[in-house]
Amino acid sequence: FERTRSLQDPCSNCPAGTFCDNNRNQICSPCPPNSFSSAGGQRTCDICRQCKGVFRTRKECSSTSNAECDCTPGFHCLGAGCSMCEQDCKQGQELTKKGCKDCCFGTFNDQKRGICRPWTNCSLDGKSVLVNGTKERDVVCGPSPADLSPGASSVTPPAPAREPGHSPQ
């Protein structure tokens, strides 16, 4: 099938990094500067992505692969292939349309991104608060006083934090 296809379509012989140039009798021509083709048999080359503004170049464009961007310090990537950059906040804050805002009492964020999440409710597990929560840290739950027996001093770590629903990644 491949041999038949090659006979019918000379463009199928053009490798990645080239395009099938209709203006030159379907000769395989190299991709022009700032363009690429990642597969063979292409009739055009794609324009390279430019990483500008908040985006910085993680990988340069080549004739066979697109440039890859990441975000400048103080920002983080969002979306497939780092299609967006979102600004960081401090721990204990969340990003809103009014900028970075402190977590409300009873919530925390231990990262520079994402949303403030409620402190763990220790009493739901029949435990007591061993260490109070802050804007930056969840509470630490400990055994309830009734559970304390001589020699027992185990501390239960807080439940794993939920994934922030703030930033689709």
Partner: nanobody, 123 residues
Framework: EVQLVESGGGLVQPGGSLRLSCGAS????????MLWFRQAPGKGLEWVAN????????YYVDSVKGRFTISRDNAKNSLYLQMNTLRAEDTAIYYC????????????????WGQGTTVTVSS
């Protein structure tokens, strides 16, 4: 091609005013939140202000509140930043940026940036 081009920067004395413009092309300008950021010499990028699609919501960083005004003209595909009572600490490169699809609902990411325009406040 999706593009943002800033203009209007320059040298101004403390207490003076400048109006920055940002022309948009290659996309439906009226469908997107728009933002201004700035980068002072030797510092990181700082969010300055943002505005929603129809201009009814505007937000500012505390340091420019009452001095800067963000606005837009969807008919002209243009974003503006009116800067009054300028201070030396406002010296920076100013960038306009487009809020990505879903901005303010699911994220606060930006996806298109201009090349920047330089504002210098000095006597």
């Amino acid at each position: 091609e999706v593009q943002l081009v800033e203009s209007g920067g320059g040298l101004v004395q403390p207490g003076g005013s400048l109006r920055l413009s940002c022309g948009a092309s290659g996309f439906t300008f009226s469908s997107y939140w728009m933002l201004w950021f700035r980068q002072a010499p030797g510092k990181g990028l700082e969010w300055v202000a943002n505005i929603n699609q129809d201009g009814s919501e505007k937000y500012y960083v505390d340091s420019v509140k009452g001095r800067f005004t963000i606005s837009r003209d969807n008919a002209k595909n243009s974003l503006y930043l009116q800067m009054n009572t300028l201070r030396a600490e406002d010296t920076a490169i100013y960038y306009c940026a487009r809020g990505g699809d879903g901005y303010s609902n699911s994220h606060f990411g930006t996806d298109v940036w201009g090349q920047g325009t330089t504002v210098t406040v000095s006597s």
